[in-house]
Interface confidence: low
């Protein structure tokens, strides 16, 4: 047993264009209240299906009257937590619906009028006893910020509230096989109360009322020894008389998932992965429309106005699946450059950059060229955490401070002679060649093999390399 607790932080206009109009006015003052509905597992989400884990209604918030002309603010909230007690084990995975209701306080006949302002829904994994989880959900132009947690009620402890704690019988230590109950170190884990009659030697339980058998024993109370010799039938019920253990049907045998759902075994039962348009424990619920809010994690629902037409969920960054129910490992795309460490924070990717790099994806070299002047008209080029200068002709060295001999690299082809010049170098080509670097042979008929010599230049004339 335990309690699911929900703390609403704010309800107001969300980011993005088109701020909603205030739901209250001077003529119609109003106040808010909230309803939460919880369901076990990740499968069923329809607002109409029962809140199998429980539901709760908040107190009414303070009365709010809109100031004329003012934008819709974050609205005043009710005090306190919404608490949903649960009697059995906490399921670990759950679906929630949180509704924001408006109570109009005008002089309506028959008392105040209620109307639903916004509904948000989601599926989450949550261990009991863990810290508050914080969430933001958007419904149209409204944004709801809230935190939630599940906590066990004594004597239950553990992530599912199935382990029990009892005060120590002896001050020094717990009984055989029983651990102290963290964080209540002065208490001891109590043995679970198994099904009545469950063999204390051959049976055990992980949940109250259960009786699971150790290897070699069978029967509802684990009192029947298993004989492996007289088993004839390959599959069927175990025979209590012969003590023959025959494997029972597997949870996925006969595929319990309807409508083309695929079945996978879980430690306790099975799980159906449903095709688009179906949901429920066995994919038995059909006719999902966008009105049912089938897209999770802020997915946008398109189409599906009537039960016969399919809907499509357009998922926000970081989520995928036909209902945006699966988180994408966006770091697997290695978005951080220059050896940056990728962190997927859910709402965003963050790159932790190595020294010398910055930017959202560590794409910028830091300070490579800052304060670095390249002399004599050179330009600074960033790269690899170190700067280098691309020097103007006639200059070289790390900062372009050294005079370079432009002819040192022997740039004139085909025996051309190189002359240093204030604006670069000049090649005097050997007979039969032309071009800035004497790179083009001149055909015997005087035509060049490649671009014609510019007007005023004859083959063999010195050509200045600009």
């Amino acid at each position: 047993a335990g309690v699911f607790e929900l703390q609403i932080h704010s309800f107001g206009p969300g980011p993005g264009p088109g701020a909603p109009r205030s739901p209250c006015s001077a003529r119609l003052p109003c106040r808010l209240f909230f309803r939460v509905c919880l369901k076990p597992g990740l499968s069923e989400e329809a607002a109409e299906s029962p809140c199998a884990l429980g539901a709760a209604l908040s107190a009414r918030g303070p009365v709010y009257t809109e100031q004329p002309g003012a934008p819709a603010p974050d609205l005043p909230l009710p005090d306190g937590l919404l608490q949903v007690p649960f009697r059995d084990a906490w399921p670990g995975t759950f679906s929630f619906i949180i509704e924001t209701w408006r109570e109009e306080l005008g002089d309506q006949i028959g008392g105040p009028a209620w109307s639903l302002l916004a509904r948000v829904a989601g599926r989450r994994r949550l261990a009991a006893g863990g810290p508050w989880a914080r969430d933001i959900q958007r419904a149209g132009a409204w944004e709801l910020r809230f935190s939630y947690r599940a906590r066990c009620e004594p004597p239950a402890v553990g992530t599912a509230c199935t382990r029990l704690c009892r005060p120590r019988s002896a001050p020094s230590r717990c009984g055989p096989g029983l651990r102290p109950c963290a964080p209540l170190e002065d208490e001891c884990e109590a043995p679970l109360v198994c099904r009545a009659g469950c063999s204390p030697e051959h049976g055990f339980c992980e949940q109250p009322g259960e009786c699971r058998c150790l290897e070699g024993w069978t029967g509802p109370l684990c009192t029947v020894p298993v004989s492996t010799s007289s088993c004839l039938s390959p599959r069927g019920p175990s025979s209590a008389t012969t003590g023959c253990l025959v494997p029972g049907p597997g949870p996925c045998d006969g595929n319990p998932c309807a409508n083309g759902g695929s079945c996978s075994e879980t430690p306790r039962s099975f799980e159906c992965t449903c095709p688009r348009g179906f949901y429920g424990l066995r994919c038995e619920v059909s006719g999902v429309t966008c009105a049912d809010g089938p897209c999770f994690n802020g997915g946008l629902c398109v189409g599906g106005a009537d039960p016969d037409s399919a809907y499509i969920c357009h998922c926000p960054p970081g989520f995928q699946g036909s209902n945006c129910e699966k988180r994408v490992d966006r770091c697997s795309l290695q978005p951080c450059r220059n050896g940056g460490l990728c962190l997927d924070l859910g709402h965003a990717l963050r790159c932790r950059c190595r020294a010398g790099f910055a930017g959202p994806r560590c794409e910028h070299d830091l300070d490579d060229c800052a304060g670095r002047a390249c002399a004599n008209g050179g330009t600074c080029v960033e790269g690899g955490g170190a700067h280098r200068c691309s020097c103007a002709l006639g200059f070289g060295g790390r900062d372009c401070r050294e005079r370079a001999d432009p002819c040192a690299a022997r740039p004139c082809a085909h025996g051309g002679r190189c002359y240093a010049h204030f604006s670069g170098l000049v090649c005097a080509c050997a007979p039969g060649y032309m071009g800035a670097r004497c790179e083009f042979p001149v055909h015997p008929d005087g035509a060049s093999a490649l671009p014609a010599a510019p007007p005023g230049l004859r083959p063999g004339d010195p050509q200045r390399y600009l």
């Epitope: 703390q7 603010p73 933001i136 924070l345 709402h347």
Partner: antibody, heavy 122, light 107 residues
């Protein structure tokens, strides 16, 4: 770089109003909420409220409800905080600060203005 | 409102000392806590967010820990430039609230 620049010091008489501005630069103005925090001489920090610059939505601390108004002008990336019916105990340095909330993570009030001194005296 | 109580209200320590400041919330705030440093005449500066994450550019001698209701800011080896007032702030529930501050003096 990312910064918040506030308007200059103000001297006001009791009962008057003061309007302090906070101009944002170096980041997407509508992407982060702005909070106002004040500090009376020799005292600790006191949270006044916040504004969502995108929608104009606000949330004010109970103590200042009815006296404070937070607005924004997205065209000039500026947030304003107006405090009315000033009293001598409103004498304080008023700071604007950027809220580093992500959807699942809280980065703190990560960028602060330089502060605006408001003195209320006869 | 959630009350944030810091202790001690002032502390005097020598350069190189290890200094610990605690902050207690009146109710569970999970890890939604930040620590700030404020030097005389200056705006506060974010040191730690989400209880234990070090803000970029803050020296690694600062560290934060805790969750729920009890939190700690530790300066592993005090430096002269650490003379300041340190404040905690909760961001779990509106209104955000600050601790009253701890004034750190150098002996």
């Amino acid at each position: 770089q990312v910064q918040l620049v506030q308007s200059g010091a103000e001297v006001k008489k009791p009962g008057a109003s003061v309007k302090v501005s906070c101009k944002a630069s170096g980041y997407t103005f509508t992407g982060y909420s702005i909070h106002w925090v004040r500090q009376a001489p020799g005292q600790g920090l006191e949270w006044m409220g916040w504004i969502n610059p995108n929608s104009g939505g606000t949330f004010y601390a109970q103590k200042f409800q009815g006296r404070v108004t937070m607005t924004r002008d997205t065209s000039i990336s500026t947030v304003y905080m107006e405090l009315s019916r000033l009293r001598s105990d409103d004498t304080a340095v008023y700071y604007c600060a950027r809220d580093g909330w992500g959807d699942y993570y809280y980065y703190g009030l990560d960028v602060w203005g330089q502060g605006t001194t408001v003195t209320v005296s006869l | 409102d959630i009350q944030m109580t810091q202790s001690p209200s002032s502390v005097s320590a020598s350069v190189g000392d290890r200094v610990t400041i605690t902050c207690r919330a009146s109710q569970d705030i999970s890890s939604w806590l930040a620590w700030y440093q404020q030097k005389p005449g200056k705006a506060p500066k974010l040191l730690i967010y989400t209880a234990s994450s070090l803000q970029g550019g803050v020296p690694s001698r600062f560290s934060g820990s805790g969750s729920g209701t009890d939190f700690t800011l530790t300066i592993s080896s005090l430096q002269p430039e650490d003379l300041a007032t340190y404040s905690c702030q909760q961001a779990n529930v509106f209104p955000y609230t600050f601790g009253q501050g701890t004034k750190l003096e150098i002996k």
